[in-house]
């Protein structure tokens, strides 16, 4: 996941805000399905 | 260099798939954005889509839009299309835009 | 969402004068300086000419500038070329990217 050429804070700040909204879907998933298996 | 494709004449209502392909250069590894020109107005963003497939929209789109993408693919799905939505659209790469697409026409006309 | 308006168009320039546009926000850009400005010739896609409110885009003449802070950014085109005659749009970036948008275009008339 490279995300581009730039290095400014705008183009930071928009792969952080990426990485964190990814990471809450993938623990959502994850914890919706373990809620599912009990 | 990237390209657009699917643009054409639709009725009001009929939801319409943009595609962004690129040649000479790997999508995957960057955000891409669309951004729409109405005939002879200025740009208006519409939204992007990060590397790891999160997306964000202007506040105008109200859901009505859905960018997506695949490892060589990025497309933008248009539901509820209006006259308001005839324009030229383009995807760009980055978020800042660097290196954009020649531009597909979309007419939305009963 | 946030408004950029800029100068009013058309501003007219001689070769070899110096053009400037101003864009005003009416909210401050992320960090002050998350603003990008813009080349349009009929016809053609826009082209990146400055991100980050200052920083030149590869290939772009020195001859562009970006200068501004907050919510006031200026292009400043200086030893203006015939070339130059286009449409320029600033973009601004915010802290919630609903709110990003373009300003509504300067045109530039070179005589």
């Known amino acids: 996941h490279s995300d581009g050429i730039f290095t400014d804070s705008y183009s930071r700040y928009r792969k952080q805000m990426a990485v964190k909204k990814y990471l809450a879907a993938v623990l959502g998933k994850r914890y919706k399905q373990r809620v599912k298996n009990k | 260099s990237v390209e657009e494709s699917g643009g054409r004449l639709v009725t009001p209502g009929t939801p319409l798939t943009l595609t962004c392909t690129a040649s000479?250069?790997?999508?995957?590894?960057?955000?891409m954005g669309w951004v729409r020109q109405a005939p002879g107005k200025g740009l208006e963003w519409i939204g992007d889509?990060?590397?790891?497939?999160t997306t964000d929209y202007a506040s105008w789109v109200n859901g009505r839009f859905t960018i997506s993408r695949t490892s060589t693919t990025v497309t933008l799905k248009m539901t509820s299309l209006t006259t308001e939505d005839t324009a030229t659209y383009f995807c760009?790469?980055?978020?800042?835009?660097?290196?954009w697409g020649p531009g597909t026409l979309v007419t939305v006309s009963s | 969402a946030a408004v950029l308006t800029q100068t009013p168009s058309p501003v007219s320039a001689a070769v070899g004068g110096t053009v400037t546009i101003k864009c005003q926000s009416s909210?401050?850009?992320?960090?002050?300086?998350?603003l990008a400005w813009y080349q349009q010739k009929p016809g053609q896609p826009p082209k990146l000419l400055i991100y980050?409110?200052?920083t030149l885009a590869s290939g772009v003449p020195s001859r562009f500038k970006g200068s501004g802070s907050g919510t006031q950014f200026t292009l400043t085109i200086n030893g203006v070329q015939c070339d130059d005659a286009a449409t320029y749009y600033c973009?601004?970036?915010?802290?919630?990217?609903?709110?990003?948008?373009f300003g509504g275009g300067t045109e530039v008339v070179v005589k």
């Open positions: 760009a790469r980055d978020y800042w835009l660097s290196l």
């Open positions: 000479g250069i790997d999508l995957s590894g960057y955000a």
């Open positions: 889509i990060s590397t790891y497939g």
């Open positions: 909210q401050s850009v992320y960090d002050n300086n998350a």
């Open positions: 980050a409110a200052s």
């Open positions: 973009l601004g970036g915010y802290d919630d990217p609903a709110d990003n948008a």
